[in-house]
Interface confidence: low
């Protein structure tokens, strides 16, 4: 990355000595061009072997001058090989070459770590022509270096379909240590060992690490980066950080809080969202999780009726979404509800208990002991029953619904009667003679109509028959009682 200027370093010399062709130091360039970045190499020489006095690549031209004198080999001149500087300083370096004037259209490109630097606006190529040769100086400047500018820079020149490569110029940007790995916040079990890691790099190396716990240094002797701190265990929350030191100074990591896992706080704001005859939908706001994720919650339900046996119903559910529908409750009943949640450490205390009520429901059982008999003198059918047990009425009884079906010679007719809640008998007029009357009764509350009783059948004879007897709800096991008179 080529960054904008903040400070300038001392300039490096453009080239170490005079060029062939008596190039004077006060020559001004006839032409100064920005770096041409569109060029792609056609041929690259292999790197020079170690031990050679000049590590750049050399091109031996195949052409001769008018007098047939062979031209000398072309090579970039030696320049500074290693530049060390601090972050944010400026740097300028160059490569230079003298090219016989017989060559046209020479192009110099800059490369860093094997990749061409395209669009690098701080590269300038200057041409100094003379009688026989042109001195070419390619300068590269970075106005405010950063770590990403570290690397090996070279010049390449394309000439005669071959490439000449300069010696590398190594740029080493030094600065304060830079963290590549910092300690992370953790939630740990009390008195259980855990590790924290800290890693920082230069240059300059080495980088040494000190650990700090609650503003106090943990290790008297620094450790070389990377460093792993093993903490044998904590009994209370602590804040850790690490200091990274090198010759340029010190950098401090972020402070991280190490929390001790504990049982959760009890849930708060337990609320009734919806209530039906046999269920209650509740929600709650979880308490503090004790630095350990909630696993599940327990809803505890007890009857608020002082006459109840005080037993507690337990319903387990997942910790999310802080909602639960409590089912299998009695209608028109009061309940106390509490919520407790657990994490890996244990269960929270129970939330403050809240009072909730179920609504009225339809009765869950039918009237009992239904009996039916024919009162022939008044041409009525008398029906008697016992009301269902109070517990199973699921609300305040408002009456009964009587279904009576008359069947005769393939014709069937159903009639419904509504009866008030007082009393346990009713009288219906005979609808058809020489027919079967089937009676069923259901209890009714404001919550709805309960189940109908088992059918009770009675035969209504033609006029003039005298004897009759009642018909009643069968004993268990008798499926379809019919009393024929």
């Amino acid at each position: 990355a080529i960054t904008e200027a903040r400070e300038e370093a001392k300039p490096y010399p453009l080239f170490p000595g005079p060029f062939p062709g008596s190039l004077q130091t006060d020559h001004t360039p006839l032409l100064s061009l920005p770096h041409a970045s569109g060029y792609q190499p056609a041929l690259m020489f292999s790197p020079t072997q170690p031990g050679r006095p000049h590590t750049g690549n050399v091109a031996i031209p195949q052409v001769t001058s008018v007098e047939s004198k062979p031209l000398p080999p072309l090579a970039f001149k030696h320049t500074v090989g290693h530049i060390i500087l601090s972050e944010h300083k400026g740097v300028k370096f160059n490569c230079s070459i003298s090219v016989p004037n017989i060559y046209q259209d020479t192009t110099i490109s800059w490369w860093k770590d094997g990749k061409e630097l395209l669009g690098a606006h701080h590269a300038i190529t200057q041409f100094y022509p003379d009688d026989e040769v042109t001195a070419i100086i390619a300068s590269f400047s970075i106005t405010s270096v950063q770590r990403s500018d570290n690397g090996s820079y070279i010049c390449k020149m394309k000439i005669n379909n071959e490439e000449i490569v300069s010696d590398p110029i190594y740029i080493e940007v030094q600065g304060l240590p830079h963290f590549t790995k910092q300690p992370e916040s953790m939630n740990v079990t009390r008195n259980t060992a855990f590790n924290l890691t800290c890693q920082a790099v230069g240059p300059p190396e080495p980088v040494n690490i000190f650990w700090v716990q609650n503003s106090s240094r943990v290790n008297e002797q620094p450790e070389k980066s990377p460093s792993v701190l093993t903490v044998p265990g904590l009994t209370e929350m602590a804040v850790f950080s690490c200091e990274a030191h090198n010759d340029k100074g010190l950098t401090v990591s972020k402070g991280v809080q190490i929390n001790i896992k504990a049982i959760p706080s009890p849930p708060t704001e337990v609320s009734i969202r919806n209530s039906t005859a046999h269920s209650i939908l509740i929600s709650w706001v979880p308490g503090f999780d004790g630095y350990s994720p909630f696993r599940n919650c327990s809803i505890q339900v007890k009857e608020a009726d002082p006459l109840s046996n005080g037993s507690v119903m337990i319903f387990n559910t997942s910790a999310l979404p802080h909602l639960y529908q409590i089912k299998q409750l009695q209608a028109l009943a009061n309940y106390s509800i509490g919520v407790s949640c657990m994490n890996e450490i244990g269960w929270s205390a129970v939330s403050p208990w809240i009072l909730a009520s179920t609504t009225e429901g339809a009765p869950s059982v039918a009237p009992l002991n239904v009996t039916v008999f024919l009162n022939e003198s008044s041409d009525n059918v008398d029906i008697r029953w016992m009301k269902p047990p109070t517990k199973q009425q699921d609300g305040e009884l408002v009456g009964y619904r009587i279904s009576h079906v008359w069947q005769s010679a393939g014709i069937s007719k159903e009639l419904l009667e509504e009866v008030g809640q007082n009393g346990s008998r009713a009288r219906i007029s005979v609808q058809v003679h020489n027919a079967t009357c089937t009676v069923r009764i259901a209890a009714v509350t404001r919550g709805g109509v309960g189940p109908f009783s088992d059918p009770v059948k009675i035969f209504i004879p033609a006029h003039g028959w005298v004897d009759y007897a009642p018909s009643s709800t069968p004993a268990p096991g008798n499926a379809d009682p019919v009393l024929i008179i």
């Epitope: 916040s185 809080q257 959760p264 609320s271 503090f288 909630f294």
Partner: antibody
Framework: QVTLKESGPGILQPSQTLSLTCSFS??????????VGWIRQPSGKGLEWLAH???????YYEPALKSRLTISKDSSKNQVFLKIANVDTADTATYYC??????????????WGTGTTVTVSS | QIVLSQSPAILSAFPGEKVTMTCRAT?????MHWYQQKPGSSPKPWIY???NLTSGVPARFSGSGSGTSYSLTISRVEAEDAATYYC?????????FGGGTKLEIK
């Protein structure tokens, strides 16, 4: 982008009822986990939480003011309302509404309105 | 109710100094939240759940604490940090704020 904007009468007289409206955008009060609260600040003094309302219509009030406060919402219009009955000069303040961030085990006011100034004066 | 006491009420510091303000609760709270308010502006959430910085808050700020004692620390104060900082608990109704610490830059 979440924004909240308070509106109110500006000036009212002692014993009147103060009605405030918080109009918001960028979130819905029908969505799981959403809540909006009211906070006030007398000039030059600190902040005082007044009330908040959750997406499922549960309401919570500052106990000392509970008898005078009513919070409500119209989720379809993205509005929350606060009424303060029987105001007196001590209710003169800047009133803020703020969205509540509902974390797994914590809550805080994560976006605040710009506030509306209310003066109670005879 | 839980009362939050912030100290000091006014804190003066030079740029570059490290400052710490504290918030003490009369009963234990799960988490402490901190808000920054500048004159004429509404409060901004600054630190939530004791030590988490909200988006855009510089890393020189940090929060810590547990139980009844919490603190907000600025490692190197800058001029833009001048404001009043309020702590706030959401553990027990009423959900109270501290009285604030006003940070002045010399």
């Amino acid at each position: 982008q979440v924004t909240l904007k308070e509106s109110g009468p500006g000036i009212l007289q002692p014993s009147q009822t103060l009605s405030l409206t918080c109009s918001f955008s960028g979130f819905s009060l029908s969505t799981f986990g959403m809540g909006v609260g009211w906070i006030r600040q007398p000039s030059g003094k600190g902040l005082e939480w007044l009330a908040h309302i959750w997406w499922y219509d549960d309401k919570y009030y500052e106990p000392a003011l509970k008898s005078r406060l009513t919070i409500s919402k119209d989720s379809s219009k993205n509005q929350v309302f606060l009424k303060i009955a029987n105001v007196d000069t001590a209710d003169t303040a800047t009133y803020y509404c703020a969205r509540i961030y509902y974390g797994t085990s914590y809550r805080y006011f994560d976006v605040w309105g710009t506030g509306t100034t209310v003066t109670v004066s005879s | 109710q839980i009362v939050l006491s912030q100290s000091p009420a006014i804190l003066s510091a030079f740029p570059g100094e490290k400052v710490t303000m504290t918030c003490r609760a009369t009963s234990s709270v799960r988490y402490m939240h901190w808000y920054q308010q500048k004159p004429g502006s509404s409060p901004k959430p600054w630190i939530y759940a004791t030590y988490n910085l909200t988006s855009g808050v510089p890393a020189r700020f940090s929060g810590s604490g547990s139980g009844t004692s919490y603190s907000l620390t600025i490692s190197r104060v800058e001029a833009e940090d001048a404001a009043t900082y309020y702590c706030h608990q959401w553990s027990s109704n009423p959900y109270t704020f501290g009285g604030g610490t006003k940070l002045e830059i010399k």
